[in-house]
Interface confidence: medium
Amino acid sequence: HLIVTPSGCGEQNMIGMTPTVIAVHYLDETEQWEKFGLEKRQGALELIKKGYTQQLAFRQPSSAFAAFVKRAPSTWLTAYVVKVFSLAVNLIAIDSQVLCGAVKWLILEKQKPDGVFQEDAPVIHQEMIGGLRNNNEKDMALTAFVLISLQEAKDICEEQVNSLPGSITKAGDFLEANYMNLQRSYTVAIAGYALAQMGRLKGPLLNKFLTTAKDKNRWEDPGKQLYNVEATSYALLALLQLKDFDFVPPVVRWLNEQRYYGGGYGSTQATFMVFQALAQYQKDAPDHQELNLDVSLQLPSR
């Protein structure tokens, strides 16, 4: 159910492209293709190519993305395209001008003087943005989300986008300055990962990040469990970045116990993040118990 055919508008296409990209990434990183049949990988890559080609139809002259060409471009959607395409660069041929043009647009058009990224045209499919939905800490959450995307595109785009390092620094400054005031576990987790990527999650900030965990194994807010899976996945990525392997096992165990295999309405972010985090875990912490993730993969009937 994770290998699906992407289709629809610029948002629906990304919803459809997400599980396939992350499934291939996960199975590549964890070397589990034999379990599912190596021949299935090629079919999955074809679907990713299809999703990529379709997404280009929603790229605007400014290099940003929107649900429709005539709709105002979305900061979140453009950052998410950057995030997914940055991961897919190792899977299919992606034009660096497409990817880095989007990065440039985010920095030049949507970053405020204090480093904050602003959204002027929210996505139609609000279910796809995960824990950012109805988040009263929007400046922090969105800035962290965009910053993570920029950092994932850094190696590819640094030469093409001169302002990228400065933009990353500025966004990091904003997150660091406001981190201690955060109330929501979700925002603590996503901003924590963004700061950990920069080597700036330390001292009182690190303490806040760690003590926000419930029972030392999850980053949880009241409400949707999907958001807690997403938040805890960000937190796991932060812990792996910090090389805090004492804290890692209970978090991985909790994520595994959720038996969350992705897919379904509103699952875009949780799916992407949980598999990205667990792939990173298996890569970074190979000595820890192997995770028995029964990832079911199905190619659509032709």
Epitope: E109, Q111, P113
Partner: antibody, heavy 111, light 112 residues
Framework: EVQLQQSGPVLVKPGASVKMSCKAS????????MNWVRQSHGKSLEWIGV????????SYNQKFKGKATLTVDKSSSTAYMELNSLTSEDSAVYYC????WGQGTSVTVSS | DVVMTQTPLTLSVTIGQPASISCKSS???????????LNWLLQRPGQSPKRLIY???KVDSGVPDRFTGSGSGTDFTLKINRVEAEDLGVYYC?????????FGGGTKLEIK
């Protein structure tokens, strides 16, 4: 020659709003952030906020959030600041700075 | 918010003599990009402020070389090596590292 030309002095009643302008010339308007600063009579300077003329992104001093609104018109190289719900406390000279400084706009709030 | 403390409040100097103004910040002004955003302004009587120095020690074009800025972290100094009549006015330091930007209270330079 670099110039920031600010609009003239205003006298307004309490509760009213005022919108002042700052027209830039002699340099590339979008190349520098535009700061707005307040100076109450005989006092020091107080930072209100900043706008990026390239994309209109704004950042405010918490104290002035809801009081000041910063905008720009790239086509005329002009920055604007609107102040609302004015009280006598808002009587001051308001400067734009980019890092050049305008001559200031004097705002007097009086009934 | 970062507090900027300037001393002295008033400085009376004879023309041709040196003058020195101190500015201390409550937090380090070294930004994560490695730069220190500390500026000095001069506001002459009845005029708007004018920037003299930025990034601690870089002198703006058109500013006489008798003005020098120095310092790092939290301690900064503006020096005028030979005061001239046109230097009278109020000097302000302000920081551009942290949000919100903050100014010192000002130092009034008087000619003896």
């Amino acid at each position: 020659e670099v110039q920031l030309q600010q609009s003239g002095p205003v006298l307004v009643k309490p509760g009213a709003s005022v919108k002042m302008s700052c027209k830039a010339s002699g340099y590339t308007f979008t190349a520098y952030y535009m700061n707005w600063v307040r100076q109450s009579h005989g006092k020091s300077l107080e930072w209100i906020g900043v706008i990026n003329p390239y994309n209109g992104g704004t950042s405010y001093n918490q104290k002035f959030k809801g009081k000041a609104t910063l905008t720009v018109d790239k086509s005329s190289s002009t920055a604007y600041m609107e102040l609302n719900s004015l009280t006598s406390e808002d009587s001051a000279v308001y400067y734009c700075s980019s890092p050049y400084w305008g001559q200031g706009t004097s705002v007097t709030v009086s009934s | 918010d970062v507090v900027m403390t300037q001393t002295p409040l008033t400085l009376s100097v004879t023309i041709g003599q040196p003058a020195s103004i101190s500015c201390k910040s409550s937090q380090s002004l070294l930004d994560s990009d490695g730069k220190t955003y500390l500026n000095w302004l001069l506001q002459r009587p009845g005029q708007s402020p004018k920037r003299l120095i930025y990034l601690v020690s870089k002198v703006d074009s058109g500013v006489p070389d008798r003005f020098t800025g120095s310092g790092s972290g939290t301690d900064f100094t503006l020096k005028i090596n030979r005061v001239e009549a046109e230097d009278l006015g109020v000097y302000y330091c302000w920081q551009g590292t942290h949000f919100p930007r903050t100014f010192g209270g000002g130092t009034k330079l008087e000619i003896k």
